[in-house]
């Protein structure tokens, strides 16, 4: 960065180099040229020259004051006119940040997903911190009393493997970063409550022709946990407002749900999962469309799930999960 | 020449509580920040905190959070620390030291106030 | 917390021996926000490098500070008998703002 460029002098922040967002500060450079008394002292941000708010203190050292300073970083550094140099002579540079301590962090969660031999821990960090910022999760036996540490940036994944310490657990976050330094509440876990099944997927959907028109949904999932309860919310693609279906499941085979439908409208499906009586549960599953027929029987497998509104197909739709603004993994 | 002054030693019983100051002069009190360490005997430094006279931002060490409380008085130039339910554990030298700046360091260190608790 | 672990905790050197000492951080530290104190018996500490590798005014030329990452080191390349000293290490990286365990530098 600037920060290794060789110095004729020094430049420096008032505060700091680090300070919180919107505070006034005051840019100092000082020169120490050999055979120049400076003329002018000149102040570059972002390699822009600063044209207001300089003062000069005396003959080698000027100030640049900024208020409400916003930006998260900048690149500042400082010349001098010297007599009889036709160029500015660069005195120094520095790299300055601005930022806000960290929040509390909350919403702590700790969940096992099926299979994936981890715990995963995430939170809810709060305000943007604009300065890096890490995160130390705490997660502390209440068998053993021993502690394990874990540093990370965002959330972090904690192999079962080391948790050693029996199966009840206290996780708390720890939010750290130059301006400060916050601590969450202490979660406190159970191993055997924590595990989410392995995901629920629906792969297809038929409309049989009856007196009335009745839609089954396939659905499934490789968990292995006997109690599941689901979920499967559906709507008119055209709706707000969702409607659920709730099951008592045992996947040891392929689920087939029965849903009575409007003909020739357009829908879209998710299913999520828990283990009965425990807290968390499964995001919601990807989207998965299904138009029902006039009349005629109609069979919508998952590998058809194109894009009617981009490709102008007349049956199946996308099933990715990003169209749906509460999808993003309803555990809490 | 820059100073930071800070009161003399204390001797309190356990349970009770200590307030501290430190006066600075010679530079912009309000442009600095004002940390403070603690230093036991034969032990290292533990920071405690730091706060921003120009705002009143605080910063805590999270082993010291419901121990001390940092404040200033801008009119005079004065930070303070009060340290609240001591004990034995809380025996130690406490100094204030301005951050920032030229060095962008702790350039300044008061002499240091020794608390003894003791009943 | 950052951990600094100093090392030796404590050293002895003869006049005009060329002596280092080290520091250990637990994670990576921004070498602009590493710094070194000097402190003898009955004093506060005294700022004496900053930012990994500046003197601060005052210190003799003798002193000299490196490293980057986790790694850091002060090296005096002539000892005289008023360097004995206890020299901590201190990160402000990130909160809590930590310092070394101190390297005990004595006459020998």
């Known amino acids: 960065g600037i920060t290794n460029i060789n110095c004729s002098g020094h430049i420096w922040v008032e505060p700091a180099t680090i300070f919180k967002m919107g505070m006034n500060i005051s840019i100092y450079c000082q020169a120490a040229i050999k055979n120049c008394q400076p003329r002018k002292l000149h102040f570059y941000k972002n390699g822009i020259k600063e044209r207001f708010q300089i003062t000069r203190i005396n003959k080698t050292t000027a100030r640049l004051w900024y208020k409400n300073f916003l930006e998260p970083h900048a690149s500042m550094y400082c010349t001098a006119e010297c007599p009889k140099h036709f160029q500015e002579t660069l005195i120094c540079g520095k790299d300055i940040s601005s930022g806000y301590p960290p929040d509390i962090p909350d919403e702590v969660t700790c969940v096992i997903y099926e299979y994936s031999g981890n715990m995963t821990c995430t939170w809810n960090a709060g305000k943007l911190t604009y300065i890096d910022t890490k995160y130390v999760v705490h997660v502390k036996s209440l068998e053993t009393e021993e502690e394990q540490q874990y540093l990370t940036s965002s959330y972090i994944n904690i192999s079962t493997d080391s948790l050693q310490g029996g199966k009840k657990y206290l996780v708390w976050v720890q939010a750290a970063n130059a301006l400060g330094m916050e601590e969450s509440k202490q979660l406190q876990i159970h191993l055997d409550d924590i595990v989410i099944p392995s995901a629920a997927v629906i792969s297809r959907a038929e409309t049989i022709n009856a007196t009335v028109p009745k839609t089954i949904i396939y659905w499934d999932s490789q968990t292995t946990i006997e109690k599941v309860s689901c979920e499967m919310r559906y709507k008119a693609t055209t709706n707000q407002t969702w409607n659920v279906k709730e099951f008592d499941t045992n996947f040891t085979y392929v689920q087939q749900s029965e849903f009575y439908l409007e003909p020739n409208i357009k829908y879209v499906f998710q299913v999520r999962c828990q283990e009965t009586g425990k807290r968390y549960w499964q995001p919601w599953s990807s989207l998965f469309f299904h138009k029902t027929p006039e009349t005629v029987p109609q069979v919508t497998s998952k590998a058809f799930q194109h894009d009617t509104w981009n490709s102008g197909l007349t049956v199946a739709s996308i099933s990715t999960g990003h169209l749906t603004s509460d999808n993003r993994g309803d555990i809490g | 020449e820059f100073q930071l002054q800070q009161s003399g030693p204390e001797l309190v019983k356990p349970g009770a509580s200590v307030k501290m100051s430190c006066k600075a002069s010679g530079y912009t009190f309000t442009n600095y920040y004002m940390h403070w360490v603690k230093q036991s005997h034969g032990k290292t430094i533990e920071w405690i905190g730091y706060?921003?006279?120009?705002?009143?931002?605080?910063s805590y060490n999270q082993k010291f959070k419901g121990k001390a409380t940092l404040t200033v008085d801008k009119s005079s130039s004065t930070a303070y620390m009060e340290l609240r339910s001591l004990t034995s554990e809380d025996s130690a030298v406490y100094t204030c030291?301005?951050?920032?700046?030229?060095?962008?360091?702790?350039?300044?260190w008061g002499q240091g106030t020794t608390v003894t608790v003791s009943s | 917390d950052i951990v600094l672990t100093q090392s030796p905790a404590i050293m002895s050197a003869s006049l005009g021996e060329r002596v280092t000492m080290t520091c250990t951080a637990s994670?990576?530290?921004?070498?602009?926000?590493l710094h070194w104190y000097q402190q003898k018996p009955g004093s506060s500490p005294k700022l004496w490098i900053y930012?990994?590798?500046n003197l601060a005014s005052g210190v003799p030329a003798r002193f000299s500070g490196s490293g980057s990452g986790t790694s850091y080191s002060l090296t005096i390349s002539s000892m005289e008998a008023e360097d004995a000293a206890t020299y901590y290490c201190?990160?402000?990286?990130?909160?809590?703002?930590?310092f070394g365990s101190g390297t005990k530098l004595e006459m020998k």
């Open positions: 994670s990576s530290v921004s070498s602009s926000y």
């Open positions: 030291a301005r951050f920032g700046g030229f060095y962008d360091a702790m350039d300044y």
């Open positions: 930012s990994t590798s």
């Open positions: 201190h990160q402000y990286h990130r909160s809590p703002f930590t």
């Open positions: 706060i921003y006279p120009n705002s009143g931002d605080t």
